[in-house]
Amino acid sequence: NKILVKQSPMLVAYDNAVNLSCKYSYNLFSREFRASLHKGLDSAVEVCVVYGNYSQQLQVYSKTGFNCDGKLGNESVTFYLQNLYVNQTDIYFCKIEVMYPPPYLDNEKSNGTIIHVKGKHLCPSPLFPGPSKP
């Protein structure tokens, strides 16, 4: 038995931040689980991890330097990524493992979400026009 995951096919991070919602075919209420977001076609980089526990607040962390937060719904986990760089444009995959109560369940690999990070266009300010040509 596998959990199915739905993700938006593409998201654009205009302000270097994005909300990626992972929607599961499984109710996470009163379960202990580990939800994670992975970067790259091979899912080699674990961007963010959310530990859910029936008795505690969500534990959210990144061991790979991403600025992330997480929010839990009954059948979803939303990852909020901030301070993204243009070169972090990539495909991102949601993963879920439900540990307790047994049995252990994980997900079928999703189609992923392409996150396109748009660079900030820094226009010269009229108050500080920069050096003028002679």
Epitope: Y54, P102, P103, D106
Partner: antibody, heavy 120, light 111 residues
Framework: EVQLVESGGGLVQPGGSLRLSCAAS??????????VSWIRQAPGKGLEWIGS???????YYSPSLKSRVTISRDNSKNTLYLQLNSLRAEDTAVYYC????????????WGQGTLVTVSS | DIQLTQSPSSLSASVGDRVTITCRAS??????????LHWYQQKPGKAPKLLIY???SLESGVPSRFSGSGSGTDFTLTISSLQPEDFATYYC?????????FGQGTKVEIK
């Protein structure tokens, strides 16, 4: 035949660290369906769960030990490891690794155990 | 944490006796009709051995004189006719929630 063999026990100084190994045979640590836990038993006392690792590599730890413990594995050697830091006398115990299946998480195979004594 | 309390802590019995050990959980360990409560036997200097899983299922290779029953918070391990090799310590364990916990043990001694 499923087998688990622990090693690495012995005498350790208080404040020191231990790294125990659990060599698995008869099944793969990275194949779905089974996981492995570390469990300890102080002399003359009951059983205490330390933590578990799943085929995916995800880990779960006892809250009382979480800050001092790391469970890891080497898939190429099909071996599990337990690292426990800042050791104290009350960590003296026989340390077991035990396999569980994903349906009920009952420990169906156990290693023989390895004794760790924390003393100066 | 889910506390498991076994009773009695120890008992003396003779070969052929019927022995009953109880395990009470501080909260239900049932989920969708399955009780995540297991029983182990441990002999001195040896690792524990799984006897019963999911409250009442007999582990492969375990003699049929061992049986388990119960649901929710109250569970029982029964040895229908005690044999010499059954003198040991028995533990219950729950796998419903982390941290996984064990009962304190029941030592079965020769009368």
């Amino acid at each position: 035949e499923v087998q688990l063999v622990e090693s690495g026990g012995g005498l350790v100084q208080p404040g020191g660290s231990l790294r125990l190994s659990c060599a698995a045979s008869g099944f793969s640590l990275s194949t779905g369906g089974v996981g492995v836990s570390w469990i300890r038993q102080a002399p003359g006392k009951g059983l205490e769960w330390i933590g578990s690792i799943y085929h995916s590599g995800s880990t779960y730890y006892s809250p009382s030990l979480k800050s001092r413990v790391t469970i890891s594995r080497d898939n190429s050697k099909n071996t599990l490891y337990l690292q426990l830091n800042s050791l104290r006398a009350e960590d003296t115990a026989v340390y077991y690794c035990a396999r569980y299946e994903y349906d009920y998480y009952a420990f169906d195979y156990w290693g023989q155990g390895t004794l760790v004594t924390v003393s100066s | 944490d889910i506390q498991l309390t076994q009773s009695p802590s120890s008992l003396s019995a003779s070969v052929g006796d019927r022995v009953t050990i109880t395990c009470r959980a501080s909260q239900s360990v049932d989920f969708y009709g399955i009780s995540f409560l297991h029983w182990y036997q441990q002999k001195p200097g040896k690792a524990p051995k799984l006897l019963i899983y999911a409250a009442s299922s007999l582990e492969s290779g375990v003699p049929s004189r061992f049986s388990g029953s119960g649901s929710g918070t109250d569970f029982t391990l029964t040895i229908s006719s005690l044999q010499p090799e059954d003198f040991a310590t028995y533990y219950c364990q729950q796998s419903y929630r982390t941290p996984l916990t064990f009962g304190q043990g029941t030592k079965v001694e020769i009368k």
